[in-house]
Every structure is written in C-alpha cells, then in structure tokens.
C-alpha cells in the first residue's frame, strides 16, 4: 500500500491491504477503494477490461474468470491494485489461445493461473512431444509465459501451459504459435526477359517474379520516369512455410512506338528494396540492318580460300537466305546461324566458304535476306590475285616482237636483250607500245596487257626475254636472235617459269 | 477471448464508396493477420484481401485489385475495407477474419456487415 | 487461380449417419486446407486446419484428411447440431473457397 506524504496527493487505498489475495471459486470478492477522490475501479485480465464507478468492487460468487488485476484510480490519476486469484481446480488455466511470434521476438503465450500455488508452471509439447531444445521460456503466473526470441522453427508448435496442481499434472488447452518471420533480405526480383522487342500492335507482356518469406512484401511495375499506374495481374503461391512467390505480370494488349521504355519490377519489405528492369523497344515495322564483317572488297590469291561473312539484326526472325554469284545460288559452302541462343536475340551470322578459288571466279557474291517485313541485300567484290600468263609472243610481219600477258593484278611487261650467250639479260629495252586490252571489258578477271618493240634496234646475236610481273609473281618469254649473213632469224621462242 | 467487432450496415448508391471497420478486443493485433470475405446472398463465400499489421502491406484478391484497399490501425487495433466505384453486385454481407495471409486459416471471424448497393 | 470443387454440393443424411464431403483442387495444395461449418444468417467457423488437424473446441466427430489435390471431411455420426453449410478453402495461393456442401435433414 503506498505510503502518505503530507500536503501532495496520495494514491488510493486499498481493503483488504494486501497485493494479492486468493479467493475460492463461488466465495465472494469484496475491494474497498479508500479515497476522498475516487473514480473508478478497473479489471483487466486477457486483454480485457472491466470498470466500475463505485468504491467498492463486490463480486458475489466468484469465478475463474475474475482472476485478474483491479486497480483503483483517483482523481489525481494515481492509483493503487490488488491482484486477486480465483482458485478454481477444475479451471486452472485462463486462457487466450491465439498465439502470434514475431521471429527473435519475445512472445507471451497467455494462460495466467487461477492458483498461485501451483508448481512446475512451463510449456509442454502437444501429444507428449518434447518442445524445440533451444526454446526458452519464462513463467508468470499473472501473465502466462514468455517465449523468448521466437525462432521460424518454431511456426505452427503445438503447446501447453502445464503446472502441477496437488502432485498431478495439468495441462491448458492447446495452443498453435504462428511466427511472423523477420524480413532479413531484400525480396528476390527476377524479370522474364531483360529486353523485348515488339512491332506497334502487337501484344507486351513481361512477368516479374518477386520471392519472399511472406506474402506481405510489397511489389510493383512501375515504368521509369513517369508516374502512370500500371494495369497488372498476379499469381501467387506458398511453397511451403516462409517461402512465398509472386508473379506480376505487366500487359500491354496492343503496343505504340512511345510505349518504348524501361519498365522496372520494383519490391520492398520491411529490411529493404530491390528492382529489376527490362528495356521494351517498339518500332513500327520490321527491319533488317546487314553488317560485314570484312571489307565488301576482296582480294584473295588464286588457289586460296575466302570466308565471305556478315553479321546482321534481323526483326522479326529471318525466313530466308541466300548467296548468289553470277545468278546462280549456293545451295551449300554456307551456313547461317544466330549469334547467340538468347531468346531475344535478332542478331545472326551468315557465311560463304569459297575454296581454291580460280583466277574465273572472281565476281560478285551477294547475300541476300529476308523477313515477313522486309528484304535486304549486300554485295562482296571478289578478285582472284593471278600469277601472269604469258598469252602470245610473236615476231610480226612488221619486224615487231609482240608479247601479250593476262594476270591480276594488271601485268607489267618489261623486255630485256642478252647478248651472245650470256643468261642474264640487264639490258633493258623501251617497248614500243603497251594496251591493255580488256580495260573496258567485265570488271572482275585477268586484265590483258600487249607489249612491243622494234626487233630491227638489235645488231647481234643474242636473246630477247619478255617479262611479265605483277604482285603475284612473274613469268618470262624469250626470244633468240641468229644472224646468217645480213639474215635474222627467229629461233623458235619459249617461256620460262621464274617465281 | 478475442472478438471481432464489425461495422454496422450500411446502404450505398452505384458508383459510390464503402469502408467497413473491424475492431480486435484483446490479443496482439498487430501480428495477426485480418483479412476480409464476403458472401452474397445465397452465395458462396469470397476472399477479398488482407492485411498483417505488423508488415502493413496488403494482399489482394485479383478480382478485387484497384477497386479494394484495406488498412490497419494499429493503436486502435482497426482493421478497415473500403470497396470503391460500388455496383449493385457487390451486396454482399463483408465478414472480417483472423487468418488468411501466409497459410494462416481463418480462426476468428467478425459477425459480419451487411452493404446493399441500389439506386 | 486454384480452383476447388466441392462434392456434393448437397446431401440428405439423417441423424448418426456418417457424411463424407470430399474437395478436390485444380492444382497441389500440399496440406494447405481447412474446412469450415456455417449456419444460417452466422459467421463461418473453423472446423479443420492443415488438412487433418482439429480445431480446439470443436467435437471429435469432425475429422480431416488427404493432401495435395484430394481432400475429405468426415462426420462419423451426424448430430442436429450438424445441419449446416460445408465449405473448404485453399491457402497457397490467392485464398478460393469450394462451393460449399449444404447438409439438411433426410
């Protein structure tokens, strides 16, 4: 009972002076509030609240249920309690039976007793099962009991309050605890495609899937930079305790070109937030953009081998290729494949092996592709590098000596006289005329060259060589001069092979 | 014990708005989940969403997405429904119930709020 | 959504007969299922949690049983007290309710 100080108010007093106070179930409960300014008197007990205007509380036949806390208050707002116990054997146990943790929190699971004097007050297992090793209580009889730092492994525990009454055993009605997890990450945001790609009408739809440990987290689609709500649908399951999933899916039933953007799948919790986005392009029809990925100009030396190659984007998918030199298809050396096996991907790869190429297949090689929107085409310009090839070499009714050479690049004749027997021929010698003669003819093949010179400068015996070059190599024709008398003669000419 | 104590009934016009309380005595509140039913006449009954006090973030039935927002009060231990753009076929009596979020069952039920839409 | 199905949606049955109402899911609930008695003009209540678990207070005629998309409640001697509506009710995804079963006297 509080003690008096003179000259400041003083709580209440209370009949019988006493904290607690048992009574037996159906005797009477008599409290005298002693106070010039009383106002009320209140029980609590679950939760529950009872008030009463008169100073004094009388319960005639007492019940279990009037086990509890009364307390008097005065008009100062000081107040005094008396706890007082109903013993009831057949009810020991008042209880509340919904029992809600929230993880590494305390919780009290709410069976006060009726009987102060009971021993062994804890929890026990339903069914005789034991409890969680590591779950610990605390008991009060005025209260319940305490489980300290409710653990996840603890959701969906059966228990009991217990006590021994008279060397028995006595259990409460069961309880269930449900554990409220504690959010410890941020919920895990994953998109069903980082980017799509869409012609104007046709239908956008990305699923964001959000993974949690309760269905309380929070999850949007929110398009970036724009404050517009977003029509969205969602699934979503339990896969098992503390394991929950969503899936919100964004739709776009008929796609514009300004619906273009970043959509971002957003999420948050009570720890945290997370996001992921995808990239929407809508374009308002189909394309196909070709890349080479060597120069469209080749020059490959004869006998080589060439991979013509190109890249290309195409939206939407490819339906048909092909390659095509002098009107005429391949229908194999190619192959066509997409860069990579991502399910967005619209960028491809098409090749043309062309093998010991011969100086006549140089040309044009086009690649040609088509989709349900457009077509497109690219042109690679082939030549065939060529060692020269000594044509004709003649001496002319003119008294001229002709050599006419085909190669590639353009051959250059050059003409040397050796005289007598030497094998070296130093001596150069000025043509008298060099035509190419096939300038103005297809732009792809050997080029042709003609050379002259006058055979009537040359005085002595001795060889005449006629030699064509270009960046390939060089080949040689040769001429042999005899005089007999004032007679020159030709002997038979021939070539020789020089690399 | 624990009781629900719901709203009482209410008659709106098409178009209009409703909001339908639900008070806890006793228990921790804030950790239960609240969730709201409904049941037309003759009719089966309809989760319609629901909230855990503690998390504050409320989970909606699809069919009620956008139309439907529930709340909690959690000094007042009030959980709240309002249903918006009312049509005639939302008469329905609107239960509201312990349970119903993260596997929990519907333990504790309200007695329940009539709402009668008609012009 | 998961779907539930309820069967019968009504039966006759007399006092101490032994009813059977069966639900079954669109897809696997695993034990994600109650089952709820209501009577007219009153609030639902709380028969069986987690398939097979009974209620506290509730008699022990009522039992449970099944998992993942079949289900069963069993009344093994019907009481007066038993005319009611039957609902079951699925927790793993967005909450469905069955049909409800409606048990009336024979």
């Known amino acids: 009972q509080p003690s008096v100080s003179p000259g400041e108010p003083s709580p209440p007093s209370i009949h019988p002076a006493k904290s607690e106070l048992i009574v037996r179930v159906g005797n009477e409960i008599r409290l005298l509030c002693i106070d010039p300014g009383f106002v009320k008197w209140t029980f609590e007990i679950l939760d529950e609240t009872n008030e009463n205007k008169q100073n004094e509380w009388i319960t005639e036949k007492a019940e279990a249920t009037n086990t509890g806390k009364y307390t008097c208050t005065n008009k100062h707002g000081l107040s005094s309690s008396i706890y007082v116990f109903v013993r009831d054997p057949a009810k020991l146990f008042l209880v509340d039976r919904s029992l809600y943790g929230k993880e590494d929190n305390d919780t009290l699971v709410r069976c006060p007793l009726t009987d102060p004097e009971v021993t062994s007050y804890s929890l026990k297992g339903c069914q005789g099962k034991p409890l969680p090793k590591d779950l610990r209580f605390v008991p009060d009889p005025k209260a319940g009991i305490t489980i300290k730092s409710v653990k996840r492994a603890y959701h969906r525990l059966c228990l009991h309050c217990s006590a021994d009454q008279e060397g028995k055993s006595v259990l409460s009605d069961k309880f269930i605890l449900k554990v409220r997890p504690a959010f410890k990450a941020v919920p895990v945001v994953s998109v069903s495609k980082a980017s799509y790609l869409l012609r104007e009408g046709e239908e956008f739809t990305v699923t964001c899937t959000i993974k949690d440990v309760s269905s309380s987290v929070y999850s949007t689609w929110k398009r970036e930079n724009s404050q517009t709500k977003l029509q969205e649908k969602y699934n979503s399951w339990h896969h098992g305790d503390f394991n929950y999933e969503r899936q919100a899916t964004l739709t776009i039933s008929s796609a514009r070109v300004n619906d273009s953007g970043v959509f971002m799948c957003y999420a948050n919790n009570t720890f945290g937030s997370a996001n992921v986005t995808t990239t929407l392009e809508v374009v308002d029809k189909g394309f196909i953009n070709i890349f080479p990925m060597i120069n469209t100009t080749v020059f490959v030396n004869d006998g080589e081998n060439v991979d013509l190659i190109v890249e290309y984007e195409a939206f939407p998918k490819p339906e048909h290729q092909q390659w095509i030199y002098m009107n005429r298809t391949f229908t194999d050396k190619w192959e066509d494949y997409p860069k990579s096996e991502n399910e967005s991907n619209i960028r491809y790869v098409s090749e043309l092996h062309l093998t010991r190429l011969k100086g006549t297949e140089g040309g044009t090689y086009t690649f040609l592709v088509s989709n349900s929107d457009v077509n497109a085409s690219i042109a690679f310009n082939v030549y065939v590098n060529t060692k020269p090839e000594i044509l004709t070499y003649d001496r002319l009714v003119n008294g001229m000596l002709q050599c006419v050479a085909a190669g590639f690049p353009e051959p250059t004749i050059d003409w040397y006289f050796c005289p007598g027997t030497e094998q070296r021929c130093s001596a150069s010698v000025l043509p008298v005329d060099v035509q190419t003669l096939n300038a103005s003819g297809p732009p792809f093949g050997k080029l042709v060259v003609q050379s002259s010179i006058d055979s009537s400068a040359f005085k002595h015996n001795g060889t005449v060589e006629c030699k064509a070059y270009n960046d390939v190599g060089k080949t040689s024709a040769y001429f042999n001069f005899a005089f007999k008398g004032n007679n020159k003669e030709q002997i038979h000419p021939h070539t020789l092979f020089t690399p | 014990q624990v009781q629900l104590v719901q709203s009482g009934a209410e008659v709106k016009k098409p178009g209009s708005s409703v909001k339908v309380s639900c008070k806890a005595s006793?228990?921790?509140?804030?950790?239960?989940?609240i969730s709201w039913v409904r049941q037309a006449p003759g009719q089966g009954l309809e989760w319609m969403g629901g909230?855990?006090?503690?998390?504050?973030?409320?989970n909606y039935a699809q069919k009620f997405q956008g139309r439907v927002t529930i709340t909690a009060d959690e000094s007042t231990s009030t959980a709240y429904m309002e249903l918006s753009s009312l049509r005639s076929e939302d008469t329905a009596v609107y239960y509201c119930?312990?349970?119903?979020?993260?596997?929990?069952?519907?333990?504790?039920w309200g007695r329940g709020t009539l709402v009668t839409v008609s012009s | 959504d998961i779907q539930m199905t309820q069967s019968p949606s009504s039966l006759s049955a007399s006092v101490g007969d032994r009813v059977t109402i069966t639900c079954r899911a669109s897809q696997s609930i695993n034990s994600y299922l109650n089952w709820y008695q209501q009577k007219p003009g009153k609030a639902p209540k709380l028969l069986i949690y987690?398939?097979?678990s009974l209620q506290s207070g509730v008699p022990s005629r009522f039992s449970g049983s099944g998992s993942g998309t079949d289900f069963t409640l069993t009344i093994s001697s019907l009481q007066p007290e038993d005319f009611a509506t039957y609902y079951c009710?699925?927790?793993?995804?967005?909450?469905?309710f069955g049909g409800g079963t409606k048990v009336e006297i024979k």
């Open positions: 009710q699925q927790g793993v995804s967005d909450i469905t």
């Open positions: 987690a398939a097979s």
């Open positions: 119930a312990r349970g119903g979020l993260d596997t929990d069952e519907f333990d504790l």
């Open positions: 909230i855990i006090p503690i998390f504050g973030t409320a």
């Open positions: 006793g228990g921790t509140f804030s950790s239960y989940a």
